[in-house]
Interface confidence: low
């Protein structure tokens, strides 16, 4: 037989020879970093057909590193599910906690003992410093100095000194988030007042009010014979402007008899949909007449006679 087989986990006892006689036996021992667990054989014999009898290093087990418990509020996840040397231990913190220390420890061989490459990390609770103070307003728990993960504060505005109240711009509630950062910027308190929305040939059908402060919502419809150019619903935004802009009501012109009939008039009706762009609520109640979709057909405001052949 030629030289006996080599293995990852065990090595030949003694020096290998260039050839071996039939019946000759060679013995193996577990390599450094491995330990033997009976009963599997760790020897082989040169067989009559000049091959070595089957042998494997399955009896040699890798040394394993000491048990590591899950960090409090986290997990220790052994790579490949093993504590054997050469493998890693990954540490993960639960939601609301962050890792202090090494995210990965390595099971290393020191002499013949497997030990971890460092100290296991700890999972520290996510803490936030107090949220920002805001002008003309305050937040709940203002006396608290340290906030824990998902702790929330709610802002409110002070009474205004003048006739118009302060409006809270932004989300009133913010919470202590993942990276010890508040979930969003603090809101602001300021006077927001939009102009009265005037629509010629139309009328406001909801959202009536003496004044239109932040987030005031108004809906419109056009008079008979007019169609709405723009959105039927507008909102007072933080810049004291209407969003979208106040719509217009444009006159519907009569169609030509030689062309596909145009809609004679369009009267806007009240919509319950606050988002005009939403298609989920079905057809919008106010729309432009379909005549403008036909090539060569005049737009309603251009007048029919001007473009006849």
């Amino acid at each position: 037989c030629e030289e006996p087989p080599t293995f990852e986990a065990m090595e030949l006892i003694g020096k290998p020879k260039p050839y071996y006689e039939i019946g000759e036996r060679v013995d193996y021992k577990c390599k450094k970093g491995y330990f033997y667990i009976p009963p599997l054989a760790t020897h082989t014999i040169c067989d009559r057909n000049h091959t070595w009898l089957p042998v494997s290093d399955d009896a040699c087990y890798r040394e394993t590193c000491p048990y590591i418990r899950d960090p409090l509020n986290g997990q220790a996840v052994p790579a490949n599910g093993t504590y054997e040397f050469g493998y890693q231990m990954h540490f993960i913190c639960n939601e609301g906690y962050y890792l202090i220390g090494e995210e990965i420890l390595y099971c290393e061989l020191k002499g013949s003992v497997a030990i971890w490459s460092g100290k296991p990390p700890i999972c520290e609770k996510v803490l936030c410093t107090p949220p920002p103070k805001i002008k003309n307003g305050k937040h709940t728990f203002s006396e608290v100095e340290v906030f824990e993960y998902l702790d929330a504060v709610t802002y409110s505005c002070d009474p205004a000194p003048g006739p118009d109240p302060f409006s809270l711009i932004g989300e009133s509630t913010i919470y202590c988030g993942d990276n010890s950062v508040w979930s969003r910027a603090a809101p602001e308190c300021k006077v927001v007042k939009c102009r009265f929305p005037v629509v010629e040939n139309g009328k406001q059908i909801s959202g009536f009010g003496k004044k239109f402060y932040y987030k005031a919502t108004v809906m419109f419809e056009c008079d008979k014979g007019f169609y709405l150019d723009g959105s039927d619903t507008i909102v007072c935004d933080s810049n004291s402007t209407w969003d979208p802009p106040v719509p217009k009501c444009l006159k519907v012109l009569p169609p030509s008899s030689t062309k596909p009939p145009a809609l004679s008039h369009s009267v806007s009706t009240s919509s319950t949909t606050k988002s005009p762009a939403s298609s989920a609520s079905g057809p919008r109640p106010t729309y432009k007449p379909p005549v403008s979709n036909y090539p060569g057909y005049p737009k309603p405001e251009e007048g029919i006679l001007d473009s006849l052949d």
């Epitope: 667990i37 040394e63 000491p66 048990y67 409090l72 003992v113 497997a114």
Partner: antibody, heavy 118, light 107 residues
Framework: EVQLVESGGGLVQPGGSLRLSCAAS????????ISWIRQSPSRGLEWLGV???????NYNSAFMSRFTISRDDSKNTAYLQMNSLKTEDTAVYYC????????????WGQGTLVTVSS | AIQLTQSPSSLSASVGDRVTITCRAS??????LNWYLQKPGQSPQLLIY???SLHSGVPDRFSGSGSGTDFTLKISRVEAEDVGVYYC?????????FGQGTKVEIK
Amino acid sequence: EVQLVESGGGLVQPGGSLRLSCAASGGSVSSYDISWIRQSPSRGLEWLGVIWTDGGTNYNSAFMSRFTISRDDSKNTAYLQMNSLKTEDTAVYYCERVYDGYPWFAYWGQGTLVTVSS
Amino acid sequence: AIQLTQSPSSLSASVGDRVTITCRASQGISNYLNWYLQKPGQSPQLLIYYTSSLHSGVPDRFSGSGSGTDFTLKISRVEAEDVGVYYCQQYIKLPWTFGQGTKVEIK
């Protein structure tokens, strides 16, 4: 060197409850991982559970439903609360400082005897 | 839970004798085994941790060996003060468990 002294043992009827204390002197109980171990002639040494310095706990599942380990840092004392006691819980109970975070026990107290009998 | 079985359950030796106690685990525990001695009327005391490491203050006549499932505690020359019950303990897996003990007496 911290010394641990167990107390609170005594005679209790089956089904009763008992709270054992483990007072630390010469050091802070919160600075050490504290295990509770019991010993009886019939069952030998049994590890009951541990409270770690960070306040986390691990239990021997055989006792988890009945035994609770806690700590009061202000009193510098660890506790073992035992409920629904059975006659087989009769044993000497030791509180034990875990050796530098490794699970070998180098600092045994003198133990406190708990007898469960009617 | 991992079971630890010690043998013999008791032995009697003369001062100066070599004493061997074995501890067998129900599954492989690598080298995560400790040995304790409980002298009469006292609490247990740590002798050896991690199979073969002597705890501070323990005389070097004590030695430990083994790996996997079979472990041995040897006292090279037993002395009168070595009487008591010897326990092995594994810590590879919760719950940590102890052997049933080996009682050593001096003839």
